[in-house]
Interface confidence: low
């Protein structure tokens, strides 16, 4: 018996062009939820085959509404783990299917609409009781980051959770770090690998990376004698000497991280975040120094007096990152206003402004019509950063300087004759046709083919079109 656990870290647009901006359709806000399906074995199974090892559904995530101008973010996720309990043996090899579903919250007839957004399938080998396995998978244009593990529950042990281990109160002939198992009480079960350095005599673990102490011992590796301890409310198998256990300290007690590293607890273990220049499980190894020249792009390296001390890169303008290895994309902040084009020249930013705008950031809106006279009685119309002339009849062109012959385009249909007029043009229609452009035939019975007569006029009434 045991449980498979899945933790979704992030779901969002993958890298590269064409990444979607929003998981929601145009119909409005939506929220995400996940479904996990476990199938035994590594074979390529049909998508419809049952989730023989179990399945689970997450809660709904927070409502997401797309911000039109904002960059596409990692999307808000449901809280908590997805847990798939299994009653029988853990198979070791399995197929993991994670589906990301969208619940649309627009005005749907009959309630919310669900649609499958992404589906990833991983065929994996995984022993129960092991550490969290991290993974990143792409599904189309989406990227999913997640961790998973299988752990035994109750008294089950082993990589398949098939063996039952009964804690015994009597002293055991098993060696240090080994525990007796039932029903085969003369067999010793090898425990998982404890935290490195965990005392074999005074410590034990039930999960990898853990170190819990026997009565009378303390410290992250159970190497420090404890002055006093109580046996009240203790859990875990009894000690062969005193019949009780003290629970081990938290993984970060006493800060196992050297060289100023900060400790954070992880399931059953700890993780050190090391300062610059140090690495290793406990930040115990001094790695990169200024002597290695780790600062790129003209960054200035500053180290301590000790040759093995950490380094800090002071980056020149336009670069960032712990090694000044990343060029700052200063245009990503969209400093150019009014649609100006941003150019990062390295030493400076330059905005190339659209017509009608000026200034270092295109912030000044020029008077589009200032100093722009429209000839021949035309009027200047401002808009969109460029001036436009609305020309008087008979004139055209950008500044109304060109003479326009209104009859040049032969606007009168069906053989009508065109006459240029001070207010435009007039069509003299051939017999049997009417309309401002002679476009409508007049029927022999006097009823025109106009789709609808203007108010106050009946089809067939004489009409004058200018």
């Amino acid at each position: 018996a045991g449980v498979f656990e899945l933790q979704i870290h992030s779901f969002g647009p993958g890298p590269g062009p064409g990444a979607p901006r929003s998981p929601c359709s145009a119909r409005g806000p939506c929220r995400l939820f996940f479904r996990v399906c476990l199938k035994p074995g590594l074979s390529e199974e049909a998508a419809e085959s049952p989730c023989a090892l179990g399945a689970a559904l997450s809660a709904r995530g927070p409502v997401y509404t797309e911000q039109p101008e904002a960059p596409a973010p990692d999307l808000p996720l449901p809280n908590g783990l997805l847990q798939v309990p299994f009653r029988d043996a853990w198979p070791g090899t399995f197929s993991l299917i994670i589906e990301t579903w969208r619940e649309e919250l627009g005005d749907q007839i009959g309630g919310p609409a669900w649609s499958l957004l992404a589906r990833v399938t991983r065929r994996r080998r995984l022993a129960a009781g092991g550490p969290w396995a991290r993974d990143i998978q792409r599904a189309g244009a989406w990227e999913l980051r997640f961790s998973y593990r299988a752990r035994c529950e109750l008294l089950a042990v082993g990589t398949a959770c098939t063996r039952l281990c009964r804690p015994r109160s009597a002293p055991s002939r098993c060696g240090p770090g080994l525990r007796p198992c039932a029903p085969l009480e003369d067999e010793c079960e090898a425990p998982p690998v404890c935290r490195a350095g965990c005392s074999l005599e005074h410590g034990f673990c039930e999960q990898p990376g853990e170190c819990r102490c026997l009565e009378g011992w303390t410290g992250p590796l159970c190497t420090v004698p404890a002055s006093t301890s109580s046996c009240l409310g203790l859990r875990g198998p009894s000690s062969a000497t005193t019949g009780c256990l003290v629970p081990g300290p938290g993984p970060c007690d006493g800060n196992p991280c050297a060289n100023g590293g900060s400790c954070s607890e992880t399931p059953g273990s700890f993780e050190c975040t090391c300062p610059r220049g140090f690495y290793g499980l406990r930040c115990e190894v001094s790695g990169v120094t200024c002597a290695d020249g780790p600062c790129f792009n003209g960054g200035l390296c500053v180290g301590g007096a000790d040759p093995d001390s950490a380094y800090i890169c002071h980056c020149p303008p336009g670069f960032q990152g712990s090694n000044c290895e990343k060029r700052v994309d200063r245009c990503s902040l969209q400093p150019c206003r009014n649609g100006g084009l941003c150019l990062d020249l390295g030493h400076a930013l330059r905005c190339r402004c659209r017509a009608g705008f000026a200034g270092p950031r295109c912030e000044h809106n020029l008077d589009d019509c200032a100093g722009r006279a429209c000839a021949n009685g035309g009027t200047c119309v401002e808009g969109g950063g460029a001036h436009r002339c609305s020309c008087a009849l008979g004139f055209g062109g950008r500044d109304c300087r060109e003479r326009a012959d209104p009859c040049a385009a032969r606007p009168c249909a069906h053989g009508g004759r065109c006459y240029a007029h001070f207010s435009g043009l007039v069509c003299a229609c051939a017999p049997g046709y009417m309309g401002s452009r002679c476009e409508f035939p007049v029927h022999p019975d006097g009823v025109s083919a106009l789709p609808a007569a203007p108010p106050g006029l009946r089809p067939g009434d004489p009409q004058r079109y200018l």
Partner: nanobody
């Protein structure tokens, strides 16, 4: 989980060349700063070369001009081209990786042995 697999080590005569490869799985390679360290028997582990996510590299003084570190994001692999090898380059060579948001090299390969005979 993140896995680094090195290859390309071996025995070579002084003045010869080798190309070490380090292939990464389980993580987006583009987001990793890659490095090669080496450790000779009885000596401290030392940085040989480091290549940032942008592709620019730094080298230990002892290998400058002879070693070239490059990365092939499409194949999730970092290559250390070693020319003009010297007996003092003999060591176990380890590939290491870290994300570009932290400073500790958290991911390590098993190492590949390079032996340069005179």
């Amino acid at each position: 989980q993140v896995k680094l697999v090195e290859s390309g080590g071996g025995l070579v005569q002084a003045g010869g060349s080798l190309r070490l490869s380090c292939t990464v799985s389980g993580f987006t390679f583009d987001d990793l700063v890659m490095a090669w360290f080496r450790q000779a028997p009885g000596k401290e582990r030392q940085l040989v070369s480091l290549v940032a996510t942008a592709g620019n590299s730094v080298y230990a003084d002892s290998v400058k001009g002879r070693f070239t570190l490059s990365r092939d994001n499409a194949h999730s692999t970092a290559y250390l081209q070693m020319n003009g090898l010297k007996p003092e380059d003999t060591a176990m060579y380890y590939c290491a990786a870290r994300t570009d948001s932290e400073h500790a090299f958290k991911f390590w390969g098993q190492g590949t042995q390079v032996t340069v005979s005179s």
